[in-house]
């Protein structure tokens, strides 16, 4: 099941997903996708990075934190409705069945009032981030302006998810954590 | 010592079921993922399905998708691979294969002959 | 996926003598966070199940004999049999790891000329 978010028509969406590098600039590749994730890899690939950078992007979708940190939580800029399904978020931990693959479901509603779109670069405010802390906590919300509709059941789930999975095989090398988006 | 035990092949028809077990002994199945891979006659391995330790998450090949579920019985260390829909393409050995710390296959079954054929 | 692909498909070498097998993948298995290769080589000898020999591109599984050895980074790699022995006889196998569904190389035949 997906965390759900929300973002009008017009706005710009967030789609929160992290990931602890062992040390800045020891990244892991990412790829986003629009779609459920598939087995391996992202479907409909919109944005993906490598060891060192962003390699691959498309019109207005966008990293707006840092990336190096692992924040690579991914904003779509200025939302239709055609915008709205399930994007997967993957992060591409090397390994047999080694990555971590969160579905977010973005819902877009129409506008309320239609004023010219404005571009909004502090999103934090706007689009609260849902964190698991490593991955492993209880999910803590940041209530800052509306909250997304999140079922913290869900959250739960995708952190037992974490816990079931080959990462803490990789952290003797990598050093790689993750916090659901 | 790590040891694999596996069972279940056999003549099938086109379009008919079998289901593979691989007892594990000499380590605790749900410390680890583990595998299945098959090799056709004559032919070279190819990776069919995955799974995590406590069965959480499972991976298939995309030339066995919707037709072959990998599963597991922790409590009784065995691994197991259900296939349905079976075509005269999935004539093979199939291998069960302990996966170390999600890298590579460090410990193998002997193999199971399934052979498809009307 | 990645594509492992192997050279030669069949060798043959004199008792004693020195063999090597090439394989080469589509896109690099090097993870630079933790400088590894995430290449293993694997021996099948006939109607037995393959057996891991190599990992990390060069570290020997416990057991195997040292005239077996592992190099190469990136796209590349080698396996290299030191002094060929009848038991060596068999049928050697690449695999990545690093994405993907893991995958094998198409196998190289080590024969004894």
């Known amino acids: 099941s997906e965390v759900e978010y929300r973002a009008e028509v017009g706005q710009n969406a967030y789609l929160p997903c992290f990931y602890t590098p062992a040390a800045p600039g020891n990244l892991v590749p990412v790829c986003w996708g629009k779609g459920a994730c598939p087995v391996f890899e992202c479907g409909n690939v919109v944005l993906a990075t490598d060891e060192r950078d962003v390699n691959y992007w498309t019109s207005r979708y966008w990293l707006n934190g840092d990336f190096r940190k692992g924040d690579v939580s991914l904003t779509i800029e200025n939302v239709t409705l055609a915008d709205s399904g399930i994007y997967c978020c993957r992060i591409q931990i090397p390994g047999i069945m080694n990555d971590e693959k969160f579905n977010l479901k973005l819902v877009i509603k129409p506008a309320k009032v239609t004023p010219a779109p404005t571009r909004q670069r502090d999103f934090t405010a706007a689009f609260p981030r849902m964190l698991t802390t490593r991955g492993h906590g209880p999910a803590e919300t940041q209530t800052l302006g509306s909250l997304p509709d999140i079922n913290l059941t869900q959250i739960s789930t995708l952190a037992n998810e974490l816990r079931d999975s080959r990462l803490a095989n990789d952290l003797r090398d990598s050093g790689a954590t993750i916090r659901i988006g | 010592q790590v040891q694999l035990q596996q069972s279940g092949g056999g003549l099938v028809q086109p379009g008919g079921s079998l289901r593979l077990s691989c007892a594990a002994s000499?380590?605790?199945?749900?410390?680890?993922?583990m595998s299945w891979v098959r090799q056709a006659p004559g032919k070279g391995l190819e990776w069919v399905s995955g799974i995590s330790g406590s069965g959480g998450s499972t991976y298939n090949a995309d030339s066995v998708k919707g037709r072959f579920t990998i599963s597991r019985d922790n409590s009784k260390n065995t691994l197991f691979l259900q296939m349905n829909s079976l075509r005269a393409e999935d004539t093979a050995v199939y291998y069960c294969a302990k996966i170390f710390g999600s890298y590579y296959f460090d410990y193998w079954g002997q193999g199971t002959l399934v052979t498809v054929s009307s | 996926e990645i594509v492992m692909t192997q050279s030669p498909d069949s060798l043959a070498v004199s008792l004693g003598e020195r063999a090597t097998i090439n394989c080469k993948s589509s896109q690099s298995v090097l993870y630079s966070s933790n400088n590894k290769n995430y290449l293993a080589w694997y021996q099948q000898k006939p109607g037995q199940p393959p057996k891991l020999l190599i990992y990390?591109?060069?570290t020997r599984e416990s057991g195997v004999p040292n005239r077996f050895s592992g190099s190469g980074s990136g796209t590349d790699f080698t396996l290299t049999i030191s002094s060929l022995q009848a038991e060596d006889v068999a049928v050697y196998y690449c695999q990545q790891y690093y994405s993907g569904p893991p995958t094998f190389g198409q196998g190289t035949k080590v024969e004894i000329k």
């Open positions: 990390w591109t060069s």
């Open positions: 000499g380590f605790t199945l749900s410390s680890y993922a």
